[in-house]
Amino acid sequence: LADPLDHRDAGDLWFPGESESFEDAHVEHSISRSLLEGEIPFPPTS
């Protein structure tokens, strides 16, 4: 299955001190993504 997002990207940092963005990484580490088989609710963005 294609990775919906590239988790190697650090994400979007908006302000100093803010943690990395949920986007670009978190979907890959969701339960749906871990199941591997069946429909993934997050299709590739590219």
């Epitope: 670009d24 979907v27 580490h29 749906s32």
Partner: antibody, heavy 115, light 112 residues
Framework: EVQLVETGGSLVQPGKSLRLTCATS????????LHWVRQSPEKHPEWVAH??????????YYAESVKGRFTISRDDSKSSVFLQMNSLKEEDTAIYYC??????WGQGTLVTVSS | DVVLTQAPLSVSVTPGESASISCRSS???????????LYWYLQKPGMSPHLLIY???NLASGIPDRFSGSGSETDFTLKISEVEPEDVGVYYC?????????FGAGTKLELK
């Protein structure tokens, strides 16, 4: 079938400690990032804490309201996530959910902090 | 923190009619990659929140296409085209762009 089952909620006095457990099954656990989200009666959900995977050095993040009092941890061998809650306050009273914050949420466990 | 303001606080709808819920963010939720980090959940009475829409406009798996999400960088709308009895509950918007992740105060949908 994916399951997230929270346990450990109870009635405790202010200043006391409590440890919540989220036992999971039905999916490969080790690479999943998990959260605790709480919801006070008639209020909106409030994100509490987040733990990443071993590949991310088990990085943790906390809401300011619980930082220094709550500790999130995980045991990959038991497919479980924990929330150690110390110095509990009355405002910590809520249903605590274990979730990947997207599709999958547990049924929640009720924590009541009252004297 | 990112503040999400929902309106209205409650809405009463006749089954078969449409309903719209607004969510306004205190800052842009658009990333440099063009992803908008706005999510919609429905929480039915006595249940956990349930994902409806991810990234502003994408329907989650198993959600009927009566639900749709739209918006800009800071203003978002959830529309239910033909409300059904099972749609009753509290709708929340949420952002997962930056910590702390935050939720709106909720909009309660009731049937007339």
């Amino acid at each position: 079938e994916v399951q997230l089952v929270e346990t450990g909620g109870s009635l405790v006095q202010p200043g006391k400690s409590l440890r919540l457990t989220c036992a999971t099954s039905g999916f490969p656990f080790s690479n999943v990032w998990l959260h605790w989200v709480r919801q006070s009666p008639e209020k909106h959900p409030e994100w509490v804490a987040h733990i990443k995977a071993k590949s991310d050095n088990y990085a943790t993040y906390y809401a300011e309201s619980v930082k220094g009092r709550f500790t999130i941890s995980r045991d990959d061998s038991k497919s479980s996530v924990f929330l150690q809650m110390n110095s509990l306050k009355e405002e910590d009273t809520a249903i605590y959910y274990c979730t990947d914050i997207l599709e999958y949420w547990g049924q929640g466990t009720l924590v009541t902090v009252s004297s | 923190d990112v503040v999400l303001t929902q309106a209205p606080l409650s809405v009463s709808v006749t089954p078969g009619e449409s309903a719209s819920i607004s969510c306004r963010s205190s800052r842009s939720l658009l990333t440099s990659k063009g992803i908008t980090s706005l999510y919609w959940y429905l929480q039915k009475p006595g249940m956990s929140p349930h994902l409806l829409i991810y990234r502003m406009s994408n329907l989650a798996s198993g959600i009927p296409d009566r639900f749709s999400g739209s918006g800009s960088e800071t203003d978002f709308t959830l529309k239910i085209s033909e409300v059904e009895p099972e749609d009753v509950g509290v709708y929340y918007c949420a952002q997962f762009l930056v910590y702390p992740y935050t939720f709106g105060a909720g909009t309660k949908l009731e049937l007339k």
